[in-house]
């Protein structure tokens, strides 16, 4: 079990549940989006491979004052084994392309759903 009790439910949460909850939150963000997400803020694009959760957090944590993604940031921190702070890029190996937060969320969601369907929860 992965200990991800901080954002969803008390105590340890099965990895499949934690991933499902993250997917649900990203779905909610994309479906409830009316105005440009986070005022059209740009973030670093990431490689959706190993270390993806930390890289995603490192990218999104640099967006401040955007309540719509605060829960996502908290959830991602549960998947990342080390503490991440703004301006930290240890997992972001490639920093060459910036995309809007809305596109970042959509790309991340598609990938996470594929991982979930494949049964890759860790």
């Amino acid at each position: 079990l992965t200990c991800l009790g901080g954002f969803a439910s008390p105590g340890p949460v099965p990895p499949s549940t934690a991933l499902r909850e993250l997917i649900e939150e990203l779905v909610n963000i994309t479906q409830n989006q009316k105005a440009p997400l986070c005022n059209g803020s740009m973030v670093w694009s990431i490689n959706l491979t190993a270390g993806m959760y930390c890289a995603a957090l490192e990218s999104l944590i640099n967006v401040s004052g955007c309540s719509a993604i605060e829960k996502t940031q908290r959830m991602l921190s549960g998947f990342c084994p080390h503490k991440v702070s703004a301006g930290q890029f240890s997992s972001l190996h490639v920093r060459d392309t910036k995309i809007e937060v809305a596109q970042f969320v959509k790309d991340l969601l598609l990938h996470l759903k594929k991982l979930f369907r494949e049964g890759q929860f860790n």
Epitope: S16, T17, R20, I23, E24, V27, Q31, K113, K114, F116, R117, E118, G119
Partner: antibody, heavy 123, light 107 residues
Framework: QVTLKESGPGILQPSQTLSLTCSFS??????????VDWIRQPSGKGLEWLAH???????RYNPALKSRLTISKDTSSSQVFLMLASVDTADTATYYC???????????????WGQGTSVTVSS | DIQMTQTASSLSASLGDRVTISCRAS??????LNWYQRKPDGTVKLLIF???KLHSGVPSRFSGSGSGTDYSLTIRNLEQEDIATYFC?????????FGGGTKLEIK
């Protein structure tokens, strides 16, 4: 209009391989978020999920039968196939195929079902 | 695997009645609960998904509720065409599992 129809051998002998075909219309397995499941129901017993296949060829199986099951698809002919190896009398059942969609949350809800095809394993 | 239990294997009711069919999961399935109707001719239809969302074309007399491990399907103003067997199914965790079914009969 979404429709699915199962076809199979009807009767086969123990130790043979069961081959089932699900022919569908009204949707495409080349479309994102689409999937097809196989479910069976032995006479007088409950429904048992067997396997599913997604548009991008991701496949999942019921662990209890995984070693004997193979699911595949032919997108161009709108067909999904299920093979069950080394059948026994316990595999006698009505076999259904059904569509599932994963847009939004992944509900794993089968929204359209075929009429089912009866399979009897007998020596 | 998650076990799904429908305690009533059969229910008898009169036309116009309100009928409730219950389903219990062996662990929390977080509202990923779907309901199906199987008619005597073998036709299977999805009625409700994600606990309470009505599938397209399903009459509004059908409704679903529940959370955690306990869920229910309610049919208001029972009609003759509702005579069928009703199955619950959890969609939270693979392998997908079904309840044993509740056969609805007319008094």
């Amino acid at each position: 209009q979404v429709t699915l129809k199962e076809s199979g051998p009807g009767i086969l002998q123990p130790s043979q391989t069961l081959s089932l075909t699900c022919s569908f219309s009204g949707f495409s397995l080349s479309t994102s978020d689409m999937g097809v499941d196989w479910i069976r129901q032995p006479s007088g017993k409950g429904l048992e999920w067997l396997a599913h296949i997604w548009w991008d060829d991701v496949k999942r199986y019921n662990p209890a039968l995984k070693s004997r099951l193979t699911i595949s698809k032919d997108t161009s002919s709108s067909q999904v196939f299920l093979m069950l190896a080394s059948v026994d009398t316990a595999d006698t059942a009505t076999y259904y195929c059904a569509r599932t969609v994963s847009s939004g949350y992944i509900y794993y809800a089968m929204d359209y079902w075929g009429q089912g095809t009866s399979v009897t394993v007998s020596s | 695997d998650i076990q799904m239990t429908q305690t009533a294997s059969s229910l008898s009711a009169s036309l116009g009645d309100r009928v409730t069919i219950s389903c219990r999961a062996s662990q929390d399935i977080r509202n990923y609960l779907n309901w199906y109707q199987r008619k005597p001719d073998g036709t299977v239809k999805l009625l409700i998904f994600y606990t309470s969302k009505l599938h397209s074309g399903v009459p509004s007399r059908f409704s679903g509720s529940g959370s955690g491990t306990d869920y229910s399907l309610t049919i208001r103003n029972l009609e003759q065409e509702d005579i069928a067997t009703y199955f619950c199914q959890q969609g939270n965790t693979l392998p997908l599992t079904f309840g044993g079914g509740t056969k609805l009969e007319i008094k």
